[in-house]
Amino acid sequence: AVNGTSQFTCFYNSRANISCVWSQDGALQDTSCQVHAWPDRRRWNQTCELLPVSQASWACNLILGAPDSQKLTTVDIVTLRVLCREGVRWRVMAIQDFKPFENLRLMAPISLQVVHVETHRCNISWEISQASHYFERHLEFEARTLSPGHTWEEAPLLTLKQKQEWICLETLTPDTQYEFQVRVKPLQGEFTTWSPWSQPLAFRTKPAALGKDT
């Protein structure tokens, strides 16, 4: 068995992708390894080749079908194995039973756009990508706005505790460049985590009208 210095972590994007990371201290960088997925109640199985992402970790994506196809449900259990080549045969390094809807990480929101911008306000909308219809409205969002002279880490988080794919940013400074990001998380799942942040959307507030009190 793999000792405590090894980790095997996977997430399901709720549709047709399981992304996995395997790390093992002391493993050879050029070792050929793969992840094999066997669902308990499906006719298909899938394999992906683990590729190095750092000195001691490897990652791969199990592509289960077309991006928007619903390949797994809340009752599925997938047995995931890490196999590494040793000479002419494959050695099993780790075995994990994985409940997909307990291990969710959605794709980052897409299609961010400015709906309306004023001197102190900006209305922004976005869309979720490859998210299961099973969630219905059971999603939440976090958003952040990058102000001049600050970092993303300093930006306060705005929480939307419902499926609301828009936000009205207020108390902005006129004629100022901002960037905006949003991420999404389903409400269900023992190990469910936030999606990656969306690509930043850059926008500029309108300048204050000359001669008027702002």
């Epitope: 068995a1 793999v2 000792n3 405590g4 090894s6 980790q7 095997f8 972590t9 780790a94 994990q96 039973d97 994985f98 409940k99 307990e102 291990n103 799942g189 023992e190 190990f191």
Partner: nanobody, 127 residues
Framework: QVQLVESGGGLVQAGGSLRLSCAAS????????MGWFRQAPGKEREFVAA????????MYAVSTEGRFTCSRDNAENTVYLQMNSLKPEDTAIYYC????????????????????WGQGTQVTVSS
């Protein structure tokens, strides 16, 4: 904290199946990660399987070769070990264990990670 009682062991022929149960009482079962270990005569205690608090991830010893399935029912305060295609080398005392600390289900835990142990149930596989 919980107390653990295993059951379901016995004598079975090679190729047969057994389902072990581990009933927990006296605590909040869903706040514990649960594991199964085994100890054959003259050998060290060996990891078999471990499942997270909600059962979202379960790690198995490579030696189980996909023959064993660990599951839990938090409503019934019970964790199970379904053992299929049993071999003589599976003969051992099987122990249920509970872990009070957080377990992510992404690595193989050590027996020292578990704080609470059952008394064990004997499994004998004859050839």
């Amino acid at each position: 904290q919980v107390q653990l009682v295993e059951s379901g062991g016995g004598l079975v022929q090679a190729g047969g199946s057994l389902r072990l149960s581990c009933a927990a009482s006296g605590g909040t079962f869903s706040s514990y990660a649960m594991g199964w270990f085994r100890q054959a005569p003259g050998k060290e205690r060996e990891f078999v399987a471990a499942t997270t608090r909600g059962g979202g991830r379960t790690m198995y010893a490579v030696s189980t070769e996909g023959r064993f399935t660990c599951s839990r029912d938090n409503a019934e305060n019970t964790v199970y070990l379904q053992m299929n295609s049993l071999k003589p080398e599976d003969t051992a005392i099987y122990y249920c264990a509970a872990m009070t600390s957080y377990y992510s289900g992404t690595y193989y835990p050590d027996s020292s990670d578990f704080d609470i142990w059952g008394q064990g149930t004997q499994v004998t596989v004859s050839s």
